[in-house]
């Protein structure tokens, strides 16, 4: 069950909940946003203060890391299995250092299995964080510091830091280095969402959240 099911079962308070996959006993702790846009959102990524190192290995990105109450990555394997069981939407919420907020909403999101390196699939972009997708389309394989699956000679994950669906290297990386205020400009390896803030701007906060399309 995901946060949408938790919400429908009567839990309407934001917080950390234990989620399971259908036909599985495997449990994962995730933060559920039960207020934004009707609630039921499963948070799959959050950056807010630089407290967690996102330059992690393939296996760490596979199973997840960090603190669900703070900065964390839910885990590619769980997200892949979840998003291949029914249609999910992906909402990416962004904050800059000047107090502005924006979002990108994809009407269909799923990750391929590990067989294809958790390749990202996205359709139907709307929102205020750019008319063009800052995640390259068609979607690319996921890369980490020890799994160079991008299309650049440069090894994007090592150069830009963090695991991401790099192209060569592409217009985004929400798992890049966290830079504090007044150090967040002209940073090639920061938290980037090009079609909102350009190439050198490193964001203050990001949240990636998913919910069934029929919620």
């Amino acid at each position: 069950r995901d946060c949408a099911e938790v919400f429908k079962s009567g839990h309407t308070t934001n917080g950390v909940y234990t989620l399971t996959l259908p036909n599985s006993t495997e449990e994962v702790k995730a933060y559920c946003d039960m207020e934004a846009g009707g609630g039921g959102w499963t948070i799959i990524q959050r950056r807010e203060d630089g407290s967690v190192d996102f330059q992690r290995t393939w296996k760490e990105y596979k199973v997840g890391f960090g603190n669900p109450s703070g900065e964390y990555w839910l885990g590619n394997e769980f997200v892949s299995q979840l998003t291949n069981q029914q249609r999910y939407v992906l909402k990416i919420h962004l904050k800059d250092w000047e107090g502005n907020e924006a979002y990108s909403l994809y009407e269909h999101f799923y990750l391929s299995s590990e067989e294809l390196n958790y390749r990202i699939h996205l359709k139907g972009l709307t929102g205020t964080a750019g008319k063009i997708s800052s995640i390259s389309q068609p979607g690319n394989d996921f890369s980490t510091k020890d799994a160079d699956n991008d299309k650049c000679i440069c090894k994007c994950s090592q150069m830009l830091t963090g695991g991401w669906w790099f192209d060569a290297c592409g217009p985004s990386n929400l798992n890049g280095m966290y830079y504090p205020q007044r150090q967040n400009t002209n940073k090639f390896n920061g938290i980037k969402w090009y079609y909102w803030k350009g190439s050198g701007y490193s964001l203050k906060g990001t949240t990636m959240m998913i919910r069934p399309a029929d919620f």
Epitope: W58, E114, E115, P138, D141, D146, A147, D148, N149, K151
Partner: antibody, heavy 120, light 107 residues
């Protein structure tokens, strides 16, 4: 430099088994996925299988699935291909190939090959 | 499975010629395309990955381009050592598949 040396090829009768090996050197073997690719005499290239860097994931082409098994021993820097129920159409040069990463699917460095002939 | 069709299957060219080999996939492979060179009796050697990235040590006379389903390998000025068979390969998804090869011969 990267070096891949295949061995174990030879003549084998149809229906029998054979194991070919690949000794790797010049790189950190346990950090890379490995593939087997074959080439029948005078023909093109055919991908057979991949094993991930840690041995956890393996994928095969339909032509060998259920008959061939890819494995590795990271402590010995060696890749294996166990071939069972061999057929005449399995006659080919068998190449051991390094992946560019843990499993990028890009075929980076190739060994010189070992010839397997299936004949009665 | 994704099929890869290479053309031509063979070509004759002279030293110094510009040679172009094309490769077509049965579906969009999103630039997950590589090119290999194979000389008689030798193992293949990787030339290009991700459509256009030259493998380390490969001379700049080789270049690759394309997108979607259609890709091209170009040799800007053919030299004696370039007379070989060239293969394209998609690594978008399993099973990995190769084109049938293009044999470049001396005119």
């Amino acid at each position: 430099q990267v070096k891949l040396v295949e061995s174990g090829g030879g003549v084998v009768q149809p229906g029998r088994s054979l194991r070919v090996s690949c000794a790797a050197s010049g790189f950190t073997f346990s950090s890379y996925g490995m593939h087997w690719v074959r080439q029948a005499p005078g023909k093109g290239l055919e991908w057979l299988a991949i094993i991930w860097y840690d041995g956890d994931n393996k994928y095969y082409s339909d032509s060998v699935k259920g008959r061939f098994t890819i494995s590795r021993d990271n402590s010995k820097n060696t890749l294996y291909l166990q071939m069972n129920s061999l057929r005449a159409e399995d006659t080919a040069e068998y190449y051991c190939v390094r992946d560019a990463s843990i499993a990028s699917r890009f075929l980076d460095y190739w060994g010189q090959g070992t010839l397997v002939t299936v004949s009665s | 499975d994704i099929q890869m069709t290479q053309s031509p299957s063979s070509l004759s060219a002279s030293i110094g010629d510009r040679v172009t080999i094309t490769c077509r996939a049965t579906q969009d492979i999103n630039n997950y395309l590589a090119w290999f060179q194979q000389k008689p009796g030798k193992a293949p050697k990787s030339l290009i990955y991700a459509t256009s990235n030259l493998q380390s040590g490969v001379p700049s006379k080789f270049s690759g381009s394309g997108s979607g389903t259609d890709y091209t390998l170009t040799i800007s000025s053919l030299q004696p050592e370039d007379f070989s068979t060239y293969y394209c390969q998609q690594y978008h998804s399993y099973p990995l598949t190769f084109g049938g090869g293009t044999k470049v011969e001396i005119k």
